[in-house]
Interface confidence: medium
């Protein structure tokens, strides 16, 4: 039975050229987290593996930094970075938990962070 919930940074916005932290937090479960994947649509951005540590996909190495924690930092943002991002927690014995973040990259200097929300 999957009892956990993923809390994410929700809908967020940031300025073009700036950076943003994508964060998810898994709670309400004692399951072991064996790996966390960060994906944009079906593209793998990064993996944090319990045994091996971080791996950043080669095509994102220049603009993606691991952390803080199990989060991911996106740098040198462009308008093309606008879209859905997913944190996928692989756990035992629960299985797979997925959290969603929507990032909007704005041309203007007015970029407000959205509220946090729960994904069951």
């Amino acid at each position: 039975m999957m009892t956990g919930t993923i809390e994410t940074t929700g809908n967020i916005s940031a300025e073009k050229g700036g950076s943003i932290i994508l964060q998810c937090h898994l709670s309400s479960t004692t399951a072991q987290v064996t790996q966390v994947n960060w994906e944009q649509q079906d593209q793998l951005l990064a993996i944090c593996n319990a045994d091996l540590g971080w791996h950043i996909s080669p095509s994102f190495k220049d603009r993606v930094a691991p952390g803080p924690g199990l989060g991911l930092t996106l740098q040198s943002l462009t308008v093309n970075d606008t879209g859905e991002y997913f944190c996928i927690y692989h756990t035992y014995p629960d299985g797979t938990y997925t959290g969603r973040i929507f990032l909007e990259v704005l041309e203007s200097s007015v970029a407000e962070h959205g509220a946090r929300f729960q994904i069951p």
Partner: antibody, heavy 119, light 107 residues
Framework: EVQLVESGGGLVQPGGSLRLSCAAS????????MSWVRQAPGKGLEWVAT????????YYPDSVKGRFTISRDNAKNTLYLQMNSLRAEDTAVYYC????????????WGQGTLVTVSS | DIQMTQSPSSLSASVGDRVTITCKAS??????LNWYQQKPGKAPKLLIY???NLQTGVPSRFSGSGSGTDFTFTISSLQPEDIATYYC?????????FGQGTKVEIK
Amino acid sequence: EVQLVESGGGLVQPGGSLRLSCAASGFTFSSYTMSWVRQAPGKGLEWVATISSGGSYTYYPDSVKGRFTISRDNAKNTLYLQMNSLRAEDTAVYYCTRWLLSLYAMDYWGQGTLVTVSS
Amino acid sequence: DIQMTQSPSSLSASVGDRVTITCKASQNINVWLNWYQQKPGKAPKLLIYKASNLQTGVPSRFSGSGSGTDFTFTISSLQPEDIATYYCQQGQTYPFTFGQGTKVEIK
């Protein structure tokens, strides 16, 4: 070319023990989660055990928990399955598989080794 | 445990036919559904991962779709070399479970 070659199968009496090995080549073995999956004669597939890349985490279904132990030697590129207290229902072909944890899919399988538990 | 129910359990079709196999999960598994092909006397081979993604080197006549509890596997034009048993497998929750298999034969 990725290769997984199982060995160690054979005939064993109920209550007995057997150790299966899987020699891996053609990829960086220490970077991959590995599993054993079995198939009873004429039946479907059943997941048996999984071990994380560094060996820190092991997972089993209830049907084998406490009887089977999965382990690995990354220096030797070898995966193991120690099977104790064997039962007739453990008779099957045992496949060594490589997991792509990013997909939760098994992308390479060995040819299998047959384990027969019978008196 | 999550139960995976495949249908049909077997089918017979002609070369060139469109073949469809369904897989139903007993609870929501999102897109964590894989399809494998097992030819007689051989090990299974991964064809489709995460419901709809074609594994590298697999012919494009194979495809998959679905999410949640209902999934479909399709061979758009059946070829003689496609004679095999096809299995779905869920990767949402431990223990990972497989469907009972669908045996595909040529008429």
